[in-house]
Protein backbone atom coordinates (compact mmCIF):
# COMPACT_ATOMS: atom_id res chain seq x y z
CA UNK A 1 0.00 0.00 0.00
CA UNK A 2 2.64 2.67 1.01
CA UNK A 3 4.81 2.25 -2.07
CA UNK A 4 6.28 6.00 -1.40
CA UNK A 5 9.63 6.89 -0.32
CA UNK A 6 10.92 9.85 1.55
CA UNK A 7 14.51 11.48 0.51
CA UNK A 8 15.87 13.63 3.03
CA UNK A 9 19.45 16.26 3.14
CA UNK A 10 20.29 13.33 5.31
CA UNK A 11 23.30 14.19 7.99
CA UNK A 12 24.05 17.79 7.42
CA UNK A 13 26.50 20.37 9.04
CA UNK A 14 26.26 24.37 9.49
CA UNK A 15 27.86 26.77 11.18
CA UNK A 16 26.97 28.49 14.18
CA UNK A 17 24.89 32.01 13.38
CA UNK A 18 24.52 31.12 9.87
CA UNK A 19 21.21 29.51 7.81
CA UNK A 20 20.38 25.94 6.77
CA UNK A 21 17.39 24.31 4.54
CA UNK A 22 15.66 21.47 5.62
CA UNK A 23 14.58 19.33 2.75
CA UNK A 24 12.44 16.31 2.09
CA UNK A 25 11.01 14.84 -0.84
CA UNK A 26 8.21 11.91 -1.27
CA UNK A 27 8.54 10.09 -4.68
CA UNK A 28 7.16 6.90 -5.91
CA UNK A 29 3.60 7.13 -4.96
CA UNK A 30 0.37 8.17 -6.51
CA UNK A 31 -0.79 9.45 -2.69
CA UNK A 32 -1.59 13.15 -2.51
CA UNK A 33 0.10 15.21 0.22
CA UNK A 34 -2.49 16.85 2.43
CA UNK A 35 0.19 18.47 5.06
CA UNK A 36 3.51 18.46 5.96
CA UNK A 37 4.88 18.78 9.88
CA UNK A 38 8.21 19.72 10.94
CA UNK A 39 9.26 18.60 14.30
CA UNK A 40 12.53 19.11 16.37
CA UNK A 41 14.59 16.12 18.21
CA UNK A 42 12.50 17.29 21.37
CA UNK A 43 8.79 16.35 19.18
CA UNK A 44 8.13 19.85 19.78
CA UNK A 45 6.20 21.39 16.05
CA UNK A 46 7.93 23.98 14.34
CA UNK A 47 5.96 24.10 11.32
CA UNK A 48 3.44 23.07 9.39
CA UNK A 49 2.18 23.01 5.66
CA UNK A 50 -0.90 22.84 4.93
CA UNK A 51 -2.48 22.14 1.19
CA UNK A 52 -5.71 24.10 2.07
CA UNK A 53 -3.92 26.92 4.58
CA UNK A 54 -0.22 27.37 3.87
CA UNK A 55 2.09 27.21 6.15
CA UNK A 56 2.16 28.18 10.01
CA UNK A 57 5.06 28.43 11.70
CA UNK A 58 4.92 27.82 15.68
CA UNK A 59 5.37 30.66 17.65
CA UNK A 60 8.73 29.87 19.50
CA UNK A 61 10.35 29.61 16.21
CA UNK A 62 8.69 32.45 14.00
CA UNK A 63 11.86 34.86 14.25
CA UNK A 64 14.38 32.20 13.18
CA UNK A 65 12.27 29.65 10.51
CA UNK A 66 11.56 30.35 7.26
CA UNK A 67 9.15 28.29 5.09
CA UNK A 68 10.20 26.22 1.70
CA UNK A 69 12.05 26.30 -0.39
CA UNK A 70 8.94 24.18 -1.44
CA UNK A 71 8.00 22.11 1.33
CA UNK A 72 11.11 22.38 3.05
CA UNK A 73 12.17 24.60 6.04
CA UNK A 74 15.00 27.21 6.44
CA UNK A 75 16.65 27.55 10.02
CA UNK A 76 18.53 30.94 10.63
CA UNK A 77 20.43 32.28 13.20
CA UNK A 78 21.93 28.81 14.38
CA UNK A 79 22.55 28.45 17.46
CA UNK A 80 24.68 25.15 19.14
CA UNK A 81 21.14 24.38 21.06
CA UNK A 82 20.00 23.20 17.05
CA UNK A 83 22.29 20.56 17.36
CA UNK A 84 20.06 17.49 16.85
CA UNK A 85 17.71 15.74 14.87
CA UNK A 86 14.58 17.09 12.95
CA UNK A 87 11.72 15.29 11.18
CA UNK A 88 9.81 15.58 8.61
CA UNK A 89 5.79 14.04 8.30
CA UNK A 90 4.22 13.85 5.34
CA UNK A 91 0.37 13.30 5.63
CA UNK A 92 -1.09 11.20 2.30
CA UNK A 93 -4.45 10.08 1.41
CA UNK A 94 -4.50 6.97 0.97
CA UNK A 95 -1.27 5.76 1.83
CA UNK A 96 -0.95 7.57 5.17
CA UNK A 97 1.87 9.06 7.19
CA UNK A 98 5.44 9.13 5.97
CA UNK A 99 8.13 10.42 7.71
CA UNK A 100 12.33 11.34 7.39
CA UNK A 101 14.90 12.32 9.55
CA UNK A 102 17.51 15.03 9.04
CA UNK A 103 20.22 14.83 11.53
CA UNK A 104 21.76 18.54 11.90
CA UNK A 105 25.30 19.52 13.23
CA UNK A 106 25.48 23.28 14.40
CA UNK A 107 29.49 23.76 14.84
CA UNK A 108 31.34 26.62 16.02
CA UNK A 109 32.27 28.84 12.54
CA UNK A 110 35.91 28.20 13.18
CA UNK A 111 35.14 24.48 13.06
CA UNK A 112 32.73 24.57 9.83
CA UNK A 113 35.31 26.48 8.01
CA UNK A 114 37.91 24.05 8.86
CA UNK A 115 35.92 20.93 7.98
CA UNK A 116 34.46 22.40 4.88
CA UNK A 117 38.01 22.86 3.95
CA UNK A 118 38.99 19.41 4.20
CA UNK A 119 35.78 17.90 2.89
CA UNK A 120 36.24 15.60 -0.02
CA UNK A 121 34.17 17.15 -2.98
CA UNK B 1 -20.25 27.40 1.21
CA UNK B 2 -18.11 24.32 0.60
CA UNK B 3 -20.10 21.76 -1.94
CA UNK B 4 -20.42 19.36 -4.68
CA UNK B 5 -22.11 19.71 -7.61
CA UNK B 6 -23.19 16.50 -10.06
CA UNK B 7 -25.07 16.92 -12.87
CA UNK B 8 -28.50 15.33 -13.78
CA UNK B 9 -29.23 11.97 -14.15
CA UNK B 10 -28.57 10.11 -17.43
CA UNK B 11 -30.90 7.23 -19.33
CA UNK B 12 -28.85 5.24 -21.58
CA UNK B 13 -28.93 2.19 -23.73
CA UNK B 14 -26.46 -1.06 -23.12
CA UNK B 15 -22.80 -0.23 -25.13
CA UNK B 16 -23.64 3.67 -25.09
CA UNK B 17 -20.95 5.84 -22.32
CA UNK B 18 -21.61 8.42 -20.13
CA UNK B 19 -19.83 11.27 -18.44
CA UNK B 20 -20.94 12.21 -14.94
CA UNK B 21 -19.39 15.49 -13.71
CA UNK B 22 -18.93 16.74 -10.14
CA UNK B 23 -18.16 20.69 -9.66
CA UNK B 24 -16.79 21.76 -6.33
CA UNK B 25 -16.87 25.14 -4.93
CA UNK B 26 -16.29 27.12 -1.55
CA UNK B 27 -12.82 25.70 -0.74
CA UNK B 28 -9.60 24.94 -3.11
CA UNK B 29 -10.80 22.32 -5.20
CA UNK B 30 -6.43 21.19 -5.69
CA UNK B 31 -6.24 20.76 -1.85
CA UNK B 32 -8.08 17.86 -1.28
CA UNK B 33 -8.77 14.31 -2.64
CA UNK B 34 -11.79 13.44 -4.95
CA UNK B 35 -12.98 9.76 -4.48
CA UNK B 36 -16.00 8.18 -6.54
CA UNK B 37 -18.44 5.66 -4.74
CA UNK B 38 -20.93 3.78 -6.03
CA UNK B 39 -24.61 2.62 -5.09
CA UNK B 40 -26.80 0.05 -6.80
CA UNK B 41 -29.69 -0.12 -6.46
CA UNK B 42 -31.09 -0.76 -2.68
CA UNK B 43 -27.13 -1.84 -2.09
CA UNK B 44 -24.89 -0.47 0.08
CA UNK B 45 -21.88 1.82 -0.56
CA UNK B 46 -18.56 0.85 -3.03
CA UNK B 47 -15.63 3.30 -3.72
CA UNK B 48 -14.50 3.21 -6.78
CA UNK B 49 -11.34 4.88 -6.73
CA UNK B 50 -9.99 7.97 -6.33
CA UNK B 51 -8.41 11.01 -8.09
CA UNK B 52 -5.25 13.18 -7.12
CA UNK B 53 -6.32 16.74 -7.57
CA UNK B 54 -3.14 17.92 -7.76
CA UNK B 55 -1.48 15.63 -10.46
CA UNK B 56 -4.47 14.50 -11.81
CA UNK B 57 -3.20 10.68 -11.65
CA UNK B 58 -6.38 8.13 -11.26
CA UNK B 59 -6.41 4.99 -8.99
CA UNK B 60 -9.20 2.65 -9.40
CA UNK B 61 -10.21 0.10 -6.99
CA UNK B 62 -10.88 -3.73 -7.75
CA UNK B 63 -13.66 -4.27 -9.98
CA UNK B 64 -13.33 -0.29 -11.51
CA UNK B 65 -10.43 -0.65 -14.37
CA UNK B 66 -10.86 -0.89 -18.01
CA UNK B 67 -14.34 1.21 -18.91
CA UNK B 68 -14.42 3.71 -15.75
CA UNK B 69 -12.45 7.08 -16.31
CA UNK B 70 -11.37 9.48 -13.84
CA UNK B 71 -10.31 13.36 -14.99
CA UNK B 72 -10.19 16.75 -13.93
CA UNK B 73 -10.71 20.07 -15.05
CA UNK B 74 -9.15 22.28 -12.76
CA UNK B 75 -9.89 25.73 -14.38
CA UNK B 76 -13.89 24.76 -13.55
CA UNK B 77 -13.04 23.02 -10.45
CA UNK B 78 -14.64 19.96 -11.76
CA UNK B 79 -14.09 15.97 -11.65
CA UNK B 80 -15.03 13.74 -14.03
CA UNK B 81 -16.33 9.83 -13.95
CA UNK B 82 -16.88 8.42 -17.56
CA UNK B 83 -18.31 4.73 -17.92
CA UNK B 84 -17.96 3.39 -21.60
CA UNK B 85 -19.44 0.50 -22.90
CA UNK B 86 -22.45 0.57 -20.35
CA UNK B 87 -23.75 -2.74 -18.96
CA UNK B 88 -27.24 -2.99 -17.03
CA UNK B 89 -25.40 -3.83 -14.43
CA UNK B 90 -24.14 -0.04 -14.31
CA UNK B 91 -27.09 1.03 -13.15
CA UNK B 92 -26.40 2.34 -9.97
CA UNK B 93 -25.89 6.27 -8.38
CA UNK B 94 -22.57 7.93 -8.62
CA UNK B 95 -21.06 10.12 -6.23
CA UNK B 96 -18.38 12.14 -5.88
CA UNK B 97 -17.03 12.83 -2.55
CA UNK B 98 -14.22 14.76 -0.95
CA UNK B 99 -11.73 13.80 1.37
CA UNK B 100 -11.90 16.12 4.08
CA UNK B 101 -8.97 16.44 7.40
CA UNK B 102 -5.35 17.78 6.60
CA UNK B 103 -3.32 14.90 9.08
CA UNK B 104 -3.92 10.85 8.69
CA UNK B 105 -6.15 11.00 11.42
CA UNK B 106 -8.56 13.72 9.92
CA UNK B 107 -9.41 12.08 7.19
CA UNK B 108 -12.88 10.98 5.89
CA UNK B 109 -15.39 11.69 2.97
CA UNK B 110 -16.90 15.23 4.39
CA UNK B 111 -18.66 16.64 1.57
CA UNK B 112 -20.71 14.81 -0.84
CA UNK B 113 -22.49 15.13 -4.38
CA UNK B 114 -25.47 14.60 -4.00
CA UNK B 115 -25.93 11.50 -6.57
CA UNK B 116 -26.11 11.21 -10.14
CA UNK B 117 -27.95 8.05 -11.06
CA UNK B 118 -27.61 6.30 -14.34
CA UNK B 119 -29.93 3.73 -15.66
CA UNK B 120 -28.74 1.49 -18.21
CA UNK B 121 -31.79 -0.07 -20.50
CA UNK B 122 -32.36 -1.04 -23.58
CA UNK C 1 -8.79 -5.60 1.10
CA UNK C 2 -10.13 -4.68 4.63
CA UNK C 3 -13.07 -5.85 4.93
CA UNK C 4 -15.50 -4.41 7.50
CA UNK C 5 -18.53 -6.11 8.71
CA UNK C 6 -21.19 -4.71 10.29
CA UNK C 7 -24.28 -5.91 12.79
CA UNK C 8 -26.72 -5.90 13.27
CA UNK C 9 -27.94 -5.26 9.54
CA UNK C 10 -31.58 -4.41 10.01
CA UNK C 11 -32.45 -2.84 13.93
CA UNK C 12 -35.93 -2.19 15.09
CA UNK C 13 -36.27 0.95 17.36
CA UNK C 14 -38.35 3.84 18.95
CA UNK C 15 -37.85 7.38 19.56
CA UNK C 16 -35.76 7.25 23.21
CA UNK C 17 -33.67 4.20 22.42
CA UNK C 18 -30.33 3.52 23.15
CA UNK C 19 -29.19 2.24 20.12
CA UNK C 20 -25.94 0.59 19.27
CA UNK C 21 -23.75 -0.81 15.91
CA UNK C 22 -21.18 -2.59 15.90
CA UNK C 23 -18.17 -2.33 13.05
CA UNK C 24 -15.77 -4.89 12.87
CA UNK C 25 -12.48 -4.83 10.69
CA UNK C 26 -11.14 -7.94 9.37
CA UNK C 27 -7.52 -6.80 10.20
CA UNK C 28 -6.32 -3.28 13.06
CA UNK C 29 -6.93 -0.39 11.48
CA UNK C 30 -6.12 1.98 14.25
CA UNK C 31 -8.76 4.93 14.42
CA UNK C 32 -9.16 5.34 11.56
CA UNK C 33 -12.86 4.78 11.00
CA UNK C 34 -16.05 6.85 9.97
CA UNK C 35 -19.30 6.76 9.99
CA UNK C 36 -22.19 7.95 7.98
CA UNK C 37 -25.56 8.15 8.40
CA UNK C 38 -27.76 7.84 4.41
CA UNK C 39 -31.50 8.59 4.23
CA UNK C 40 -33.27 7.61 1.20
CA UNK C 41 -32.66 9.37 -1.88
CA UNK C 42 -29.92 11.83 -0.46
CA UNK C 43 -26.42 11.28 0.10
CA UNK C 44 -24.76 9.70 3.12
CA UNK C 45 -23.93 12.66 5.74
CA UNK C 46 -20.31 12.43 7.91
CA UNK C 47 -21.34 11.94 11.16
CA UNK C 48 -17.99 10.87 13.14
CA UNK C 49 -14.38 10.22 11.81
CA UNK C 50 -11.09 8.95 13.88
CA UNK C 51 -13.61 6.53 15.42
CA UNK C 52 -15.07 8.95 18.37
CA UNK C 53 -14.44 12.68 17.01
CA UNK C 54 -17.83 14.10 16.22
CA UNK C 55 -17.99 16.22 12.96
CA UNK C 56 -19.03 19.69 13.26
CA UNK C 57 -22.41 20.08 13.80
CA UNK C 58 -23.43 16.61 14.38
CA UNK C 59 -25.65 15.88 17.57
CA UNK C 60 -24.19 15.23 20.38
CA UNK C 61 -26.46 12.21 21.11
CA UNK C 62 -24.17 10.64 18.24
CA UNK C 63 -21.02 9.10 19.85
CA UNK C 64 -18.32 6.29 18.42
CA UNK C 65 -15.86 4.51 20.27
CA UNK C 66 -13.34 1.69 19.55
CA UNK C 67 -9.85 0.79 17.88
CA UNK C 68 -8.03 -1.64 16.24
CA UNK C 69 -10.90 -4.21 14.82
CA UNK C 70 -13.92 -3.08 16.96
CA UNK C 71 -16.22 -0.40 16.34
CA UNK C 72 -19.30 0.98 17.50
CA UNK C 73 -21.35 3.89 16.94
CA UNK C 74 -24.13 5.05 19.84
CA UNK C 75 -27.23 6.57 19.57
CA UNK C 76 -28.28 7.79 23.29
CA UNK C 77 -31.60 9.14 22.12
CA UNK C 78 -33.27 7.46 19.27
CA UNK C 79 -34.99 10.43 18.00
CA UNK C 80 -37.35 10.30 14.74
CA UNK C 81 -34.89 12.16 12.21
CA UNK C 82 -32.20 9.31 13.08
CA UNK C 83 -34.26 6.40 11.42
CA UNK C 84 -31.99 5.61 8.48
CA UNK C 85 -29.22 3.50 7.21
CA UNK C 86 -25.90 3.93 8.57
CA UNK C 87 -22.55 2.93 7.04
CA UNK C 88 -18.70 2.37 8.62
CA UNK C 89 -15.64 2.89 6.21
CA UNK C 90 -12.25 2.54 7.57
CA UNK C 91 -9.81 4.32 5.91
CA UNK C 92 -6.31 2.79 7.02
CA UNK C 93 -6.09 1.14 3.85
CA UNK C 94 -8.07 1.88 0.52
CA UNK C 95 -10.98 2.79 1.11
CA UNK C 96 -13.85 0.36 2.54
CA UNK C 97 -17.38 0.56 3.79
CA UNK C 98 -19.23 -1.99 5.94
CA UNK C 99 -22.44 -3.67 4.40
CA UNK C 100 -24.77 -0.27 6.47
CA UNK C 101 -27.52 -0.66 9.46
CA UNK C 102 -30.67 0.34 8.61
CA UNK C 103 -32.55 1.58 11.88
CA UNK C 104 -36.12 1.24 11.08
CA UNK C 105 -39.32 2.28 13.63
CA UNK C 106 -40.55 -0.66 15.70
Known amino acids: MMTGTIETTGNISAKKGGSVILQCHLSSTMAQVTQVNWEQHDHSLLAIRNAELGWHIYPAFKDRVAPGPGLGLTLQSLTMNDTGEYFCTYHTYPDGTYRGRIFLEVLESSVAEHSARFQIP | QVQLVQSGSELKKPGASVKVSCKAS????????MNWVRQAPGQGLEWMGWINTNTGNPTYAQGFTGRFVFSLDTSVSTAYLQISSLKAEDTAVYYCARVGGYSVDEYAFDVWGQGTLVTVSS | DIQLTQSPSFLSASVGDRVTITCRASQGISSYLAWYQQKPGKAPKLLIYAASTLQSGVPSRFSGSGSGTEFTLTISSLQPEDFATYYC????????FGGGTKVEIK
Open chain 2, 26 to 33: GYTFTSYP
Open chain 3, 89 to 96: QQLSSYPT
